[in-house]
């Protein structure tokens, strides 16, 4: 189950990523606190998804990489919400 | 403040595996950048890698890629880097570091490795 | 990956006086973001190594502020302005901008 919910998640974060144009997005989302409670730094822009490393991506750049996980940790925040909301949802039927 | 405490010195064979564990306290575990550090007898300092425990995101270093694990158990706040095919060269003292600010700010107490048959 | 080269190797400096270490990294270390990730570790025998200075030039809290960092780009300095007994440790840069993150050899530190 968390493997599905993993490959959902890397789907979401990889279509969006792929559609930012998205520095102005990405420093919004880190100026809203995503980044890690002990990590982080401020935006910079976000480039294609292409290449892969372990769950989230290759990338060059140490601060680059912290952006996307915080934008990983974003969308699986915003993702759980709908989800448990579509749940709740049915409850109700 | 948070604080990193490390497993005790380990003596192992050439051939063999290590793995060092490094428990987390006083900050929230899932959600840090945990980096591994290891410094040869009298010699400077050497990144491994790094995970990202909330999705057990990893990065390594080239040179010991294949060779190292780095992993995370959330539940008991505790990081892990196995590293296998041990050489006499991998002998030194292995640090665990949480990176603050993109610098590591906090450092467990090191773990020393001796390769030795 | 990115090679931080450090000099001298090691410098004898009497109490009192200022101890600058160089910092020489084969690529600039400004990231997108308008950081400059090149810190400061000291390290004393026996012990793990500390933060003294991140970003190029802030300073850890509670860290003297005899010790200064400076620079941009590629060059970089640490600069203890008058040395302590409890100064004599190995200083190393390091940078955080690029994969593979990197040090510099150290320059170790002594009282003359």
């Known amino acids: 189950r968390r493997d599905v919910a993993h490959g959902i998640l890397n789907e979401a974060y990889r279509k969006v990523l792929d559609q930012l144009s998205a520095g102005k997005h990405l420093q919004s989302l880190v100026a809203r606190g995503v980044g890690g409670s002990l990590g982080g730094g401020a935006g910079d822009d976000a480039e294609p998804l292409s290449k892969r490393h372990s769950d989230g991506i290759f990338t060059d750049s140490y601060s680059r990489y912290r952006k996307q996980m915080a934008v990983k940790k974003y969308l699986a925040a915003v993702l759980g919400k709908r989800y448990k909301q579509r749940v709740k949802n049915k409850g109700r039927r | 403040e948070v604080q990193l405490v490390q497993s005790g010195a380990e003596v192992k064979k050439p051939g063999s595996s290590v793995k060092v564990s490094c428990k987390a306290s006083?900050?929230?575990?899932?959600?840090?950048?945990m980096h591994w550090v290891r410094q040869a007898p009298g010699q400077g300092l050497e990144w491994m890698g790094l995970i990202y425990p909330i999705f057990a995101d990893t990065r390594y270093a080239q040179k010991f890629q294949g060779r190292v694990t780095i992993t995370a158990d959330e539940s008991t706040s505790t990081a892990y880097m196995e590293l296998s095919s041990l050489r006499s060269e991998d002998t030194a003292v292995y640090y665990c570091?949480?990176?603050?600010?993109?610098?590591?700010?906090?450092w467990g107490q090191g773990t020393l490795v001796t390769v030795s048959s | 990956d990115i090679v931080m080269t450090q000099s001298p190797d090691s410098l004898a400096v009497s109490l009192g006086e200022r101890a600058t270490i160089n910092c020489k990294s084969s690529q600039s270390l400004l990231d997108a973001d308008g950081k400059t990730y090149l810190n400061w570790l000291q390290q004393k025998p026996g012990q793990p190594p500390k933060r003294l200075i991140y970003w190029a030039s802030t300073r850890e809290s509670g860290v003297p502020d005899r010790f200064s960092g400076s620079g941009s780009g590629t060059d970089f300095t640490l600069t203890i302005s008058s040395l302590q007994a409890e100064d004599v440790a190995v200083y190393y840069c390091w940078q955080g901008t690029w994969f593979d993150l990197t040090f510099g050899g150290g320059t170790k530190v002594e009282i003359k």
């Open positions: 570091a949480i990176d603050q600010d993109g610098s590591f700010a906090y």
């Open positions: 006083g900050g929230t575990f899932s959600d840090v950048y």
